[in-house]
Amino acid sequence: SAPSSSVPSSSTSPAAFLASGSAQPPPAERCPAACECSEAARTVKCVNRNLLEVPADLPPYVRNLFLTGNQMTVLPAGAFARQPPLADLEALNLSGNHLKEVCAGAFEHLPGLRRLDLSHNPLTNLSAFAFAGSNASVSAPSPLEELILNHIVPPEDQRQNGSFEGMVAFEGMVAAALRSGLALRGLTRLELASNHFLFLPRDLLAQLPSLRYLDLRNNSLVSLTYASFRNLTHLESLHLEDNALKVLHNSTLAEWHGLAHVKVFLDNNPWVCDCYMADMVAWLKETEVVPDKARLTCAFPEKMRNRGLLDLNSSDLDCDAVLPQSLQTS
């Protein structure tokens, strides 16, 4: 149905209306002035309206809420707490705002929130309890099933302590929010693309046992040595395209081999085809885990550039070649 036009806020709240004892039917649900509302579709869109905060008078029927492209910089605790609560809100899209800070308990009082998108916000301060709601060592489980955090890395000049240290701090901040109090143990989809991640914090994934889909594409991951996928027994899709991976070691390959349903996507990484690649090549030739394995080609050394990994033999893989300086750190 067509979006309802915005109705000016009435001074009488629904609760006050009922208490007045009037027998008149309640008015149609209000729609905030900067939004478009469709009760039939249970959708409210407040898009590109330069909003500085979450509208106060959101209709309680809302199931899908789009608050994209606004000017909100801080999401305070209880930003969506309403009376009556927004009990039916399932999908909340806050992408493309200017959010720098998401406070502890920002999403409290949203018992049905299944999908949250905070992408394209320069988050310098993501509270460890943003998704947990409390600082208990084991908090009540969040209802979240899908968490979309693509491109939430702040620009370099907004990160703490310069570039490398700032990235480590940023990764640690995101990891802390994801593991806090085991709140996200029901999360099945996590997107963390385009965040300049250099490494995966060791225990990032340990607290997310229900994950089926993990998107880490377009980061700067050089190695997966310290990451553990062992606990992700339900993992079906792992996207690692467009990173800086040079080789995969036996420990990682063995973990993937132990995951029953997983598909791993590895295209567009600068594979270094030297003697350290032998285990990975042998594994690739045997595995069904990597759907795009025929697309994987060597980037270095120069004499091997563009050579398909699946065609390599151990005799092709030596460690005599000089690598570019940028590839000599592991």
């Epitope: 567009n268 025929a294 080609t297 980037a299 563009n306 050579r307 398909g308 699946l310 065609d311």
Partner: antibody
């Protein structure tokens, strides 16, 4: 050194089919993607698709599915592209190139003219 | 498909000039960009791969730069043998796509 030698120019009638060849020397033929590219005046370069000879894996540009088919004969280090149901739109120069992430060696091109 | 646009279809320059050819992608391509030279006789050569790496045997007067959606090829000191059509090509996503080409001519 790497060389890709393509078959000679062809004049074909509309509705016919034809097969272009590309013979590779100077490298491990099975280990690199072999690309096919179309060049028409006013249209620049268009990627048709690719084949990995050692495995027979192929990727096609959706636009050329049903028009082009790639095969490779590893015994002779030769790749082939079959073009079917030729029309005047298929008149072009067709290149093969050694591929992967970049196309670092190109054949000299085969000119195909489709005319009644 | 990712569209590649070379906004200048042809340009004239003098010997020794610095020539810059631009190329833009319809979405971010993560530096997955190559540059090719097509000579008047139809031969095609790779010049630059992965945005800025000079292919072996290519003169150092050629250089590439860019990021995100915007890329460029620079010829620092134009020589007669540089008369050609220059194409950019993305390899970020299949199908690979080329720009429309920029023809470099002598004044």
């Amino acid at each position: 050194q790497v060389q890709l030698q393509q078959s000679g120019a062809e004049l074909m009638k509309p509705g016919a089919s034809m097969r272009l060849s590309c013979k590779a020397t100077g490298y491990t033929f099975t280990g690199y993607w072999l690309e096919w590219i179309k060049r028409r005046p006013g249209h620049g370069l268009e990627w048709i698709g690719e084949i990995l000879p050692g495995r027979g894996s192929t990727n096609y540009n959706e636009k050329f599915k049903g028009k082009a088919t790639f095969t490779a004969e590893t015994s002779s280090n030769t790749a082939y592209m079959q073009l079917t149901s030729l029309t005047t739109e298929d008149s072009a120069i067709y290149y093969c190139a050694r591929g992967g992430r970049d196309f670092d060696n190109w054949g000299q091109g085969t000119t195909l003219t489709v005319s009644s | 498909d990712i569209q590649m646009t070379q906004s200048t279809s042809s340009l004239s320059a003098s010997l020794g000039d610095r020539v810059t050819i631009s190329c833009s992608a319809s979405q971010g391509i993560n530096n997955h960009l190559n540059w090719y030279q097509q000579k008047p006789d139809g031969t095609v050569k790779l010049l630059i791969y992965y945005t800025s790496s000079l292919h072996s045997g290519v003169p150092s007067r050629f250089s590439g730069s860019g990021s995100g959606t915007d890329y460029s090829l620079t010829i620092s000191n134009l020589e007669p043998e540089d008369i050609a059509i220059y194409y950019c090509q993305q390899f970020s996503k299949l199908p690979y796509t080329f720009g429309g080409g920029t023809k470099v001519e002598m004044k």
